[in-house]
């Protein structure tokens, strides 16, 4: 096994150099020091190692910082960057910005977007910024990584940002995190006006409260089924059908097609059937009239 | 797209000559460092020689000093390996490799040519 050899007699190397492409796998296993290999960083990228050398450096860093990369290394890593894992970069601790600039540089093109978003998330919860030139950085990434970053990492992320985002950006988004969003969102649109508001917010509705979307509905936004859908049950089984009807205007016909799924379903249990057959749609799987509804929530917690 | 192409293997007796060659095609401009690498049955790959392109300097393997010389031709792109008094150990695939400046591990291979030493 490599890990049992000693290193041959006179093959110890005090400098990173050319002579070291010629060592066998193993002499460099057995020969080569981690702390020499993070003082020259630069001549581990410059000289042509093969794939093969480059991984037994990276494990000899590994092993010389078990803790993670010291940030003096990481601003020199280069196109070393491509051989850490996002694990690895999740023990580091990066502060300057000018350092993650560097390796998403050197991560462009390279498939190599769970390592970009994880450095961005490292530095984040060291107390750094994602400015726009960051997120410029970052390049083709969906911005969905927005979604991979800590609750608290988002508390970082300036609302400027939210301009970037795009309607697919947050699928995968938890409940907690389109909360979020949407106040960043807000403050993010706050000067702009009129239907162009609309526009901009309706990405991150997902996360408006039942008092945000009754505002809403004041304002003639007609808004589309499709947003309508990614609305949060919570928010949307608390609007009357008046106010579903302000907030949908001629696109209120659409919840027919949606009667029998998530979250339509669910805002139809909750209103009067009276209201509903109001609208005129033949909507079915309201409250019958004369029924009394409880909420099984308040007895749960007397139970 | 790159092309490594090698040529001049063949089997030999051990203290024979054998110069292998290689023509590059569609190498980006900024290309700085060409080399040779072989691998012999059940053994890892290794480096044999590489060139800078740039600056001419040459390195070697401790196995093959003072019996291997590798030279560029920089108009055509190519790069020769002369491998003098062979020996049954030197049996093996050599391939041609490049690289471009602070690129990571080496980009473009060959497919190789065979090396076979006789005793």
């Known amino acids: 096994d490599a890990e049992q050899k000693a290193c041959p007699p006179g093959k110890e190397p005090y400098k990173v150099d050319e002579d070291l492409i010629f060592y066998q796998n193993w002499e460099l296993e057995a020969c080569v020091d981690g702390t020499m290999l993070a003082r020259q960083m630069d001549l581990v990228n410059e000289i042509p190692f093969t794939y093969e050398q480059l991984s037994i450096f990276k494990h000899k860093l590994d092993k010389t910082y078990p803790q993670g990369y010291p940030e003096s290394l990481i601003q020199q890593l280069g196109h070393f960057f491509r051989y850490v894992s996002p694990e690895d970069i999740h023990q580091w601790n990066v502060t300057s910005p000018d350092t993650v600039k560097t390796l998403l540089k050197v991560s462009k093109g390279q498939k190599m977007n769970a390592q970009a978003i994880a450095l961005v998330a490292c530095y984040l919860r060291g107390g750094g910024q994602l400015d726009e030139d960051m997120v410029k950085a970052l390049g083709d990434i969906p911005l969905s990584y927005l979604c991979d970053f800590s609750p608290q990492d988002l508390h970082s992320v300036p609302s400027s940002v939210m301009w970037l985002v795009g309607p697919q950006d947050l699928d995968k988004c938890s409940q907690r995190h389109l909360g979020l969003l949407y106040q960043k969102a807000c403050s993010a649109f706050q000067n702009v006006s009129g239907l162009e508001y609309f526009e901009k917010i309706k990405t991150f509705l997902g996360g408006a409260s039942v008092k945000d979307l009754r505002a809403l509905s004041q304002h003639n936004v007609s808004m589309d089924i499709a947003t309508f859908k990614r609305l949060q049950v919570d928010s949307l089984v608390g609007l009357s059908v008046a106010e579903v009807q302000k907030l949908l205007g001629p696109n209120i016909v659409d919840l027919k097609t949606e009667e029998d799924k998530s979250p339509v379903r669910d805002w139809l249990f909750r209103q009067h059937q009276k209201d509903l057959d109001r609208l005129g749609l033949g909507l079915q799987g309201g409250i019958p009239n004369g029924y009394l509804v409880l909420d099984f929530n308040v007895r749960e917690a007397f139970s | 797209q790159v092309q490594l192409v090698e040529s001049g293997g063949g089997t030999v007796q051990a203290g024979g000559s054998l110069k292998l060659a290689c023509a590059a095609s569609?190498?980006?401009?900024?290309?700085?460092?060409m080399g040779w690498f072989r691998q012999a049955p059940g053994k890892e790959r290794e480096g044999v020689a590489i060139?800078?392109?740039?600056?001419?300097?040459?390195y070697y393997r401790d196995s093959v000093k003072g019996r291997a010389t590798i030279s560029q031709d920089n108009a055509k792109k190519s790069v020769s390996l002369q491998m003098n008094s062979l020996r049954p150990e030197d049996t093996a695939i050599y391939y041609c490799?490049?690289?471009?400046?602070?690129?990571?591990?080496?980009?473009?291979w060959g497919q190789g040519t065979q090396v076979t030493v006789s005793s």
């Open positions: 490799v490049a690289r471009q400046p602070n690129s990571g591990p080496w980009e473009y």
């Open positions: 569609g190498l980006p401009r900024t290309y700085n460092v």
């Open positions: 060139i800078y392109t740039t600056t001419g300097a040459t």
